[in-house]
């Protein structure tokens, strides 16, 4: 599949219209700036609750705040999936659920949120300071992961407020999809601003060619794009302060009893809002990862509807192992 963004060639201003054109070049940057700032960065929220009835029984709820379609959700504990975490459940929006002890029941709550009940007894039972992570693979945004745990002083029956996840992970599909167009717009904006700085009334030259967005190849990213997008995996434990009730979701995220609407009615929060995002609760993680699509498995892809691309660099089997399989 190829995604090409055709940008119309800019025509030179007609004589006598330089004043109006100056106005236009001032308006365009602001339009682009607004686009850049409000361009949705998806978010993942995580909520961990200890059941009052069974002190060692937990309920984890996770949700995805983005406009893309979710292709897979992985819930892990002990850290992010693939970084020391062990998979508790994998949920596919069409194909169902795979879960592992101490998971008792994983289920979809809405099209963009899931819940997982953990067993309260046995050797593999969670303890109060266990970190639980939720990773949402979506198209076109890529994979987004957030982690959370119960605050140390939690009373049974209380839940930690939803942990916001201003996560900076974007996969190839996201980068070369919607983001590609926005990136082009932002670069173009900077270019315009720079030119505007040097020349108060710039005379735009006719564009001979139509620039194209990079061509996205889901299965085999080019070496160039791999090099350009390579960011080492990092997990930052933001144990800055204990979770308090002011660690609310930036969108006034769902309370424990409130169900998310089937479709998020708001646009995801943009990069500009990161600065105002509350620090995640104690024991929460923010993961920074650039994963590129890799061919999943050695076998030729099966044909037929419902085929899902797994935007995890380690392929779909990574979902089932502690450090990822293969």
């Amino acid at each position: 599949m190829r995604t090409e963004a055709q940008v119309p060639a800019l025509q030179p201003p007609e004589p006598g219209l330089e004043g109006a054109m100056g106005h236009r070049t001032l308006v365009l940057p602001w339009v682009l700036l607004t686009l850049c700032v409000t361009a949705g960065t998806p978010e993942v929220w995580v909520q961990v609750r200890m059941e009052a009835t069974e002190l060692s029984s937990f309920t984890i709820r996770c949700g995805f705040l983005g406009s893309g379609s979710i292709s897979l959700v992985t819930v892990s504990w002990g850290g992010p999936n693939g970084a020391g975490g062990t998979t508790l459940a994998v949920l596919h929006p069409e194909r169902g659920i795979r879960q592992w002890a101490p998971a008792r029941q994983a289920r979809w709550e809405t099209q963009s949120s899931i819940s997982l009940i953990l067993e309260g007894s046995g050797a593999s039972s969670p303890c109060a300071n266990t970190t639980f992570c939720c990773k949402f693979a979506s198209f076109p945004e890529g994979s987004w992961e957030a982690c959370g745990s119960l605050p140390p002083s939690s009373d049974p029956g209380l839940s930690a407020p939803p942990t916001p996840a201003p996560i900076l992970r974007a996969d190839l599909a996201g980068i070369l999809g919607v983001s590609g167009v926005l990136l082009f717009g932002c670069v173009y904006l900077l270019h315009l601003l720079r030119r505007h700085k040097h020349r108060p009334a710039p005379r735009l030259q006719p564009s001979r060619t139509s620039p194209q967005a990079p061509r996205a190849r889901a299965w085999a990213p080019s070496q160039a794009s791999q090099a350009a997008l390579h960011v080492p995996y990092a997990t930052i434990n933001t144990s800055c302060r204990p979770a308090t009730l002011d660690t609310a979701h930036p969108h006034g995220g769902p309370s424990w009893w409130a169900s998310l609407p089937t479709h998020a009615a708001h646009r995801p929060q943009g990069p500009a809002a990161w600065a105002s995002t509350p620090i995640p609760a104690r024991g929460s993680f923010v993961s920074v990862e650039n994963g590129l699509y890799a061919q999943a498995g050695e076998r030729p892809p099966h044909t037929g509807p419902g085929l899902t691309l797994f935007p995890d660099p380690r392929g779909p089997r990574a979902m089932e192992g502690p450090l990822g399989v293969r």
Epitope: R95, R98, R299, P305, G306, G321, P322
Partner: antibody, heavy 119, light 107 residues
Framework: EVQLQQSGPELVKPGSSMKISCKAS????????MDWVKQSHGKSLEWIGA????????SYNQKFKDKATLTVDRSSSTAYMELRSLTSEDSAVYYC????????????WATGTTVTVSS | DIVMTQSQKFMSTSVGDRVSITCKAS??????VDWYQQKPGQSPKALIY???NRHTGVPDRFTGSGSGTDFTLTISNVQSEDLADYFC?????????FGGGTKLEIK
């Protein structure tokens, strides 16, 4: 060729325990989880549970939680199912089946182990 | 638990005919349904996964359809070797559950 080879038929006494083995070959054992299925004589199939050979993580049908224990031996690429406190109700054919986590289904089944519980 | 109901326990057909085996889920299971064939004295074998995708090597006379609660396995141009039990399976929720099976008999 991908193969799952199960241990032979068993005749066991009520109240006893037994262990069925399922040896995998022709693929990387830790890449696929292994599920177990029961088929009582002339009846349908019942899913017992699954094990992830990578880390030994298990998942059980609550109905079989006190009946079956799933384990793996990675060194020999073998999955095991132990059945305890056997009764005549446990007389059945037990299958191990490989779960394809790319496409979400049981793509390879073993030949099955017939267990007869009788005094 | 999700109940998978295969209402026809037995179905009789002739070689060359077209037959449809149905499976109904007690709740919405999206497309998390597979079909397995079990010939007499053998272990089950995968036919269809995710409601409509054929397993490798399965003849194209086998087709799966449906989503939500109603699923169908259709065998067109039935062959004598298709004599078998056919089971549906849901893996939308735990525990995974199979249908009661439909035995296909060849006249």
């Amino acid at each position: 060729e991908v193969q799952l080879q199960q241990s032979g038929p068993e005749l066991v006494k009520p109240g006893s325990s037994m262990k069925i083995s399922c040896k995998a070959s022709g693929y990387t054992f830790t890449d696929y989880s292994m599920d177990w299925v029961k088929q009582s004589h002339g009846k349908s199939l019942e899913w017992i549970g699954a094990i992830n050979p990578n880390n030994g993580g298990t998942s059980y049908n609550q109905k079989f939680k006190d009946k079956a224990t799933l384990t793996v031996d990675r060194s020999s690429s073998t999955a095991y199912m132990e059945l305890r406190s056997l009764t005549s109700e446990d007389s059945a054919v037990y299958y191990c089946a490989r779960w394809d986590s790319d496409y979400w289904y049981f793509d390879v089944w073993a030949t099955g182990t017939t267990v007869t519980v009788s005094s | 638990d999700i109940v998978m109901t295969q209402s026809q326990k037995f179905m009789s057909t002739s070689v060359g005919d077209r037959v449809s085996i149905t499976c109904k889920a007690s709740q919405n299971v999206r497309t998390a349904v597979d079909w397995y064939q079990q010939k007499p004295g053998q272990s089950p074998k995968a036919l269809i996964y995710s409601a409509s995708n054929r397993h490798t090597g399965v003849p194209d006379r086998f087709t799966g359809s449906g989503s939500g609660t109603d699923f169908t396995l259709t065998i067109s141009n039935v062959q004598s070797e298709d004599l078998a039990d056919y089971f549906c399976l849901q893996h939308w929720n735990y525990p995974y559950t199979f249908g009661g099976g439909t035995k296909l008999e060849i006249k």
